[in-house]
């Protein structure tokens, strides 16, 4: 069986009150991809099922929007938006594949002056 | 070094019963999803079921209503119960789950050794 790579915007920072576009990228696979979940820490953001389309959840409706592609743009930011973001990617018939995205949302002046977020 | 293993599998009349269950050893930083899959004799991989970190389940067509996946996530482990079975539910079931091993690496992604399950008409 063929492993795929998940390629993601890695490790991102946004200002508060902006928006970021979270991606990923299942590549190196001929798998047929079923479903995308994405996932906040342990909560539902969005959903994207290859028949049924996207299902936001609801308690994000108002700040989050489908796409581009299979991606996810969160607006609005607040810095309570700062953590872990997964992309679930379920295909057939190689499996699961999750990518992990880490995003800082930054007080205003903070990203003006070009701060950026880093694991050491 | 990240290992899963299954047990519960066996022989069972169609119209009862199997529990399986999943735990996850080793290296273990992270879980998104955990996971059932099976394959039968000259056919690929299928899905089972799945439940990701965040509670959400799929199930492949040919089981809803039927099985039913939980986990427990305090022990890594994740369980499938199985009602009314056919003889078409036939298969080795394989538990698949994305572990990440370290807060610096990636998902890597793991299967069981799998576990027969028969169902006799």
């Known amino acids: 069986m063929m492993t795929g790579t998940i390629e993601t915007t890695g490790n991102i920072s946004a200002e508060k009150g902006g928006s970021i576009i979270l991606q990923c990228h299942l590549s190196s696979t001929t798998a047929q991809v079923t479903q995308v979940n994405w996932e906040q820490q342990d909560q539902l953001l969005a959903i994207c099922n290859a028949d049924l389309g996207w299902h936001i959840s609801p308690s994000f409706k108002d700040r989050v929007a489908p796409g581009p592609g299979l991606g996810l743009t969160l607006q609005s930011l607040t810095v309570n938006d700062t953590g872990e973001y997964f992309c679930i990617y379920h295909t057939y018939p190689d499996g699961t594949y999750t990518g992990r995205i880490f995003l800082e949302v930054l007080e205003s002046s903070v990203a003006e002056h070009g701060a950026r977020f880093q694991i050491p | 070094q990240v290992q899963l293993v299954e047990s519960g599998g066996g022989l069972v009349q169609a119209g009862g019963s199997l529990s399986l269950s999943c735990a996850a050893s080793?290296?273990?930083?992270?879980?998104?999803?955990m996971g059932w899959y099976r394959q039968a004799p000259g056919e690929q991989r299928d899905l089972v079921a799945t439940?990701?970190?965040?509670?959400?389940?799929t199930y492949g067509d040919s089981v809803k209503g039927r099985f039913s996946i939980s986990r427990d996530s305090a022990k890594n482990t994740v369980y499938l119960q199985m009602n009314n079975l056919k003889p078409e539910d036939t298969a080795v079931y394989y538990c698949?789950?994305?572990?990440?091993?370290?807060?610096?690496?990636?998902?890597?992604?793991?299967w069981g050794q799998g576990t027969q399950v028969t169902v006799s008409s």
């Open positions: 080793g290296s273990i930083f992270g879980i998104s999803v």
């Open positions: 439940l990701t970190r965040a509670g959400l389940t």
């Open positions: 698949h789950a994305n572990i990440m091993e370290s807060a610096a690496s990636t998902f890597g992604r793991y």
